[in-house]
Interface confidence: medium
């Protein structure tokens, strides 16, 4: 479904950005962002600039990198405002100023704006060959650019669900975009996957007052249970995958198993009690009766108490326009703890190690 987005990026702070290739006039681009639940993006801070930089560098878009491209952003000069040659923004201002993070982005003007005090003007971000930000360019608001940038702000996020034995993960974000990977998921995101035996499973990121959680998934549980004993980065693996180049054991034990006395393998728990509490119940072709369950368990993880400790990961995603989500199965809910910080960022208390590497995904779903 349209409006389509070529790429999107989310950060742990709760801000998401999307880049769109479409020849819209300024106002139509603003409305396109609003129709998705966002706004035309500002780029008035270092963190926003970094997010936009990653979006652009992810690929040139339809033009194939053959020409410079212009993207609408939320930068304009009102009729009553004069050109200010000595100001970084030349008298232009952002439509949605951010008082907490308002330092100017490190971009020049590719051309000096015309001197005027009586005409409303808009500005676009010019990208060399469509991938490298060159700077701002004054534009008449009724002209069309090659694309536009949207921004979405969420108060809380869900950490990435742990796949276990799941494959074909598909995330449908609330701004109507699909991806096969998403480290930070805004409320409303739906994730679906296939479990072994052609079983489909799905869950939705649910927002409550001060937290967000995956509907029916207890913190730390996996989407699909492992047939074996070992988990590495939330995925089912075999023992050889658990030993690093020094021979150290780097895995977790799957449900029903515990670390053996040797510290390098997992053994069956002596008194394992299977519980259905907080499970995800896979269903064959979405409608059949439950055929398997994930049991509730916890493991050591990292808790981030200080805002500075939370890795500000930005993830770049290639988006398709089709949703492949099956029906959502509603099961008991729990809440991973989400803590707001003075800076307005979101700190998630993960039950497993949070993602700290940049994920780059070029597949369309």
């Amino acid at each position: 479904e349209h409006p389509t987005a070529d790429r999107a990026a989310c950060s742990a702070s709760g801000a998401c950005y999307s880049l769109h290739h479409a020849t819209f006039k300024r106002r139509a681009a603003e409305e396109a962002c609003s129709l998705r639940g966002g706004t035309l993006s500002t780029v008035h801070s270092g963190s926003e600039f970094q997010a936009v930089l990653l979006l652009l560098r992810a690929g040139p878009g339809p033009g194939g990198g053959s020409k410079d491209l212009l993207f609408w952003v939320a930068l304009e000069r009102s009729i009553s405002q004069c050109t200010q040659e000595k100001e970084p923004l030349r008298g232009f201002s952002w439509l949605h100023p951010d008082s907490e993070d308002s330092e100017d982005s490190p971009l020049p003007w590719v051309e000096e704006p015309q001197r005027s005090c009586t005409v409303r003007k808009c500005a676009a971000l010019q990208a060399t060959r469509g991938v490298e930000p060159a700077g701002w360019k004054e534009m008449r608001c009724h002209l069309r650019t090659d694309g536009y940038l949207c921004k979405y702000q969420f108060e809380v996020l869900c950490p990435a669900p742990r796949p276990g034995a799941a494959s074909n993960l598909s995330f449908q974000a609330p701004f109507r975009l699909s991806s096969s990977a998403l480290d930070f998921s805004p409320p409303g995101t739906e994730v679906s996957a296939m479990c072994p035996g052609d079983l489909s499973v799905s869950s939705t990121c649910i927002q409550e007052e001060t937290s967000a959680h995956w509907d029916g998934l207890f913190p730390g549980t996996v989407l699909c249970p492992c047939s074996g004993r070992y988990l590495l980065a939330g995925k089912c693996v075999e023992l050889p995958d658990c030993l690093d180049h020094l021979g150290d054991f780097t895995c977790e034990c799957a449900v029903g198993f515990e670390l053996g006395k040797d510290g390098r393998s997992c053994e069956t728990k002596v008194e394992e009690q299977l519980t259905l509490e907080g499970t995800k119940l896979p269903t064959r072709n979405v409608t059949a009766t439950p055929a398997g369950a994930v049991t509730n368990r916890t493991w050591p993880g990292q808790v981030y108490d200080k805002p500075g400790e939370m890795p500000q990961v930005t993830e770049i995603l290639q988006w398709g326009t089709q949703s492949t989500l099956p029906t959502i199965q509603k099961t008991p809910q729990t809440k991973p703890k989400v803590t707001g910080t003075p800076s307005g960022s979101v700190v998630l208390n993960y039950t497993s190690s949070p993602p700290v590497s940049l994920t780059f995904d070029t597949s369309s779903t």
Epitope: E1, H2, P3, T4, A22, T23, F24, K25, R27, A28, E30, E31, A32, S34, L35, R36, G37, H142
Partner: antibody, heavy 117, light 108 residues
Framework: EVQLQQSGTVLARPGASVKMSCKAS????????MHWVKQRPGQGLEWIGA????????SYNQKFKGKAKLTAVTSTSTAYMELSSLTNEDSAVFYC????????????WGQGTSVTV | QIVLTQSPAIMSASLGERVTMTCTAS???????LHWYQQKPGSSPKLWIY???NLASGVPARFSGSGSGTSYSLTISSMEAEDAATYYC?????????FGGGTKLEIK
């Protein structure tokens, strides 16, 4: 002068489909989003969705996905909405509307198409 | 989605009386994206106030709008007969666009 002229009253059977039109004049049809709004008798307004005729981008209210389909023909500056699998819940007046001068408010409205199922 | 609740649902006022109706949003709405429409029976809605406080073309100066966050209001300083109508608030801060249930203003 901006005008939106909608097609006339429709009487339809349950389960059938109807397609109504909205002909625009007085502005550049391809440059503005066209919205559709539903109003049941004696009730309030519900946003159905919007189409950008310049490239046929659409956005729907989740509630109306599968019920309404929006299209546009630029050569005649006409937007269309097709409603399928009609029930008595679809009996309503449907308006086409768009913003032109004011910030994302719906400045101009058609006279409405009445559908009775 | 953002739910807009208008109150009262129905009100009556005497000519010359000051009238205020409110619109409460379920979550915060930017004042730029809160609008009011007037609708009379058998007619299409008309844009009446846009971006919280700006009067649309042709709207009498006795009308005013104010508010921020989750609380907005439309005020008529001195009720006139032609003001009898239903007024809807409308937000475009979050998709889908939503309307309030309306306030029907009658002459007492």
């Amino acid at each position: 002068e901006v005008q939106l002229q909608q097609s006339g009253t429709v009487l339809a059977r349950p389960g059938a489909s109807v397609k109504m039109s909205c002909k625009a004049s007085g502005y550049t049809f391809t440059s503005y989003w066209m919205h559709w709004v539903k109003q049941r008798p004696g009730q309030g307004l519900e946003w159905i969705g919007a189409i950008y005729p310049g490239n046929s981008d659409t956005s729907y209210n989740q509630k109306f996905k599968g019920k309404a389909k929006l299209t546009a023909v630029t050569s005649t500056s006409t937007a269309y909405m097709e409603l399928s699998s009609l029930t008595n819940e679809d009996s309503a007046v449907f308006y086409c509307t768009h913003y032109y001068g004011s910030d994302y408010a719906m400045d101009y409205w058609g006279q409405g198409t009445s559908v009775t199922v | 989605q953002i739910v807009l609740t208008q109150s009262p649902a129905i009100m009556s006022a005497s000519l010359g009386e000051r009238v205020t109706m409110t619109c409460t949003a379920s979550s915060s709405v930017s004042s730029s994206y809160l609008h009011w429409y007037q609708q009379k029976p058998g007619s299409s809605p008309k844009l009446w106030i846009y971006s919280t406080s700006n009067l649309a073309s042709g709207v009498p100066a006795r009308f005013s709008g104010s508010g921020s966050g989750t609380s907005y209001s439309l005020t008529i300083s001195s009720m006139e007969a032609e003001d009898a109508a239903t007024y809807y608030c409308h937000q475009y801060h979050r998709s889908p666009r939503t309307f309030g249930g309306g306030t029907k203003l009658e002459i007492k």
